[in-house]
């Protein structure tokens, strides 16, 4: 028979492989049928009879289509500082990603082993770069002309306003003081009025974070411990 | 990156044979078929067969049986395919294709290598 | 060997549109079927495999859907890139084989 005809289990002709969705049996020494997704191989082929799948049980899964004995275990339930993105099922893992404020200190092949709070920039520093799903905020002194005052993974060094006649001189963790007889400019919600300014700085908007790729295929190395960066808290 | 990068293009006259070259990189050269697909001016695929590059065994699109030869060089991850008997209908852009054999899919192609055939 | 078919071989479209593209296969072949997005001079990019799984890096607004021997490939919101021409592809049985092609030109 024609390869494209033949039923499993087959012995292949000499140099070819086997088809679609099929696997060369060492031992028969013929193809057989793969297990799909959400199955596993309950009884291997013979030279007569074809591979016997059978389900996943439960809190486990195969992913691919396969020949194993038994299925793979799902991982752990999702930690407290984590977010389940993916449910465990008969076809795939359990993934957990790091929530909100958290970043992914080390990877595992799908989602995140250990997450790790963002750093906060303590005032006199502001975010140099924004913390990722996988990378931490790194922080920067304010330069000077710049300020910040909050302890924040997000807030960037602002520029401090520019007066007719300066109360206060601004520093790299507070903003310049105005002395003015004019009336007082609005302010964003929640800031201090002061005096207004010859001239309003503009708003300056948050860095948004980076795209972050997805998380690698390939097993990290853990990393030993770093201390915390300039500027930051170790919250 | 993975990438297949195929030789050139190729001129002969009908009966000669053409070898054509597929390098991969970025990737296992030997966990993944490497198929070839031609396409013939203004016309659609056509699937001519892979090759396992772990073991050199191959499946070829009876279409084709017994004029195509898929062989592989492992040592420098690149796979070749002879199509023998040329004819004028065999004018085509030649593509090889990393394949699934799960699903039968071709996820990552060359940039084609165009055989012309004529007298 | 399993014939596939498509329709319309060619389709005239503007940027914002919906448009659905149709492939019949011969025979049976359950999800087992993958889109080509093809540009002139170029390869053919995988656009969606097992009738509906989008391949990495596609843009969400291409989808599949289809069974057994009706299948059709969906563009959301047609965006200037998009025209080329689309080729299906059973991979449920051997000999592949793929559809004739399905042309989207821009009107």
């Known amino acids: 028979l024609p390869a494209q005809v033949a039923f499993t289990p087959y012995a292949p002709e000499p140099g070819s492989t086997c088809r679609l969705r099929e696997y060369y049996d060492q031992t028969a020494q013929m193809c057989c049928s793969k297990c799909s997704p959400g199955q596993h191989a309950k009884v291997f082929c013979t030279k007569t009879s074809d591979t016997v799948c059978d389900s996943c049980e439960d809190s486990t899964y195969t992913q691919l289509w396969n020949w194993v004995p038994e299925c793979l275990s799902c991982g752990s339930r999702c930690s407290s500082d984590q977010v389940e993105t993916q449910a465990c099922t008969r076809e795939q893992n359990r993934i957990c990603t790091c929530r909100p404020g958290w970043y992914c200190a080390l990877s595992k092949q799908e989602g995140c082993r250990l997450c790790a709070p963002l750093r906060k920039c303590r005032p006199g520093f502001g975010v140099a770069r924004p913390g990722t799903e996988t990378s931490d905020v790194v922080c920067k002194p304010c330069a000077p002309g710049t300020f910040s005052n909050t302890t924040s993974s997000t807030d960037i060094c602002r520029p401090h306003q520019i007066c007719n006649v300066v109360a206060i001189p601004g520093n790299a963790s507070m903003d310049a003081v105005c002395t003015s007889t004019s009336p007082t400019r609005s302010m964003a919600p929640g800031a201090v009025h002061l005096p207004q300014p010859v001239s309003t700085r503009s708003q300056h908007t948050q860095p948004t974070p980076e795209p972050s790729t997805a998380p690698s295929t390939s097993f990290l190395l853990p990393m030993g411990p770093s201390p915390p960066a300039e500027g930051s808290t170790g919250d | 990156q993975v990438q297949l990068v195929q030789s050139g293009a190729e001129v002969k006259k009908p009966g000669a044979s053409v070898k054509v070259s597929c390098k991969a990189s970025g990737y296992t050269f030997i966990t993944y078929d490497i198929n070839w697909v031609r396409q013939a001016t203004g016309q659609g695929l056509e699937w001519i067969g892979w090759i396992y590059p772990r073991d050199g065994n191959t499946q070829f699109n009876e279409n084709f049986q017994g004029r195509v030869t898929m062989t592989r060089n492992t040592s420098i991850s690149t796979a070749y395919m002879e199509l023998s008997s040329l004819r004028s209908e065999d004018t085509a852009v030649y593509y090889c294709?990393?394949?699934?054999?799960?699903?039968?899919?071709?996820?990552?192609w060359g940039q084609g290598t165009t055989v012309t055939v004529s007298s | 060997d399993i014939q596939m078919t498509q329709s319309p071989s060619s389709l005239s479209a503007s940027v914002g549109d919906r448009v659905t593209i149709t492939c019949r296969a011969s025979?049976?072949?359950?999800?087992?079927l993958n889109w080509y997005q093809q540009k002139p001079g170029k390869a053919p990019k995988l656009l969606i495999y097992?009738?509906?799984k989008l391949h990495s890096g596609v843009p969400s607004r291409f989808s599949g859907s289809g069974s057994g021997t009706d299948f059709t490939l969906t563009i959301s919101s047609l965006q200037p890139e998009d025209f080329a021409t689309y080729y299906c592809q059973q991979g449920n049985t051997l000999p592949l084989t793929f559809g004739g092609g399905t042309k989207l030109e821009i009107k």
């Open positions: 097992f009738k509906s």
């Open positions: 294709a990393r394949g699934d054999r799960d699903y039968g899919y071709f996820d990552v």
């Open positions: 025979q049976d072949i359950s999800n087992y």
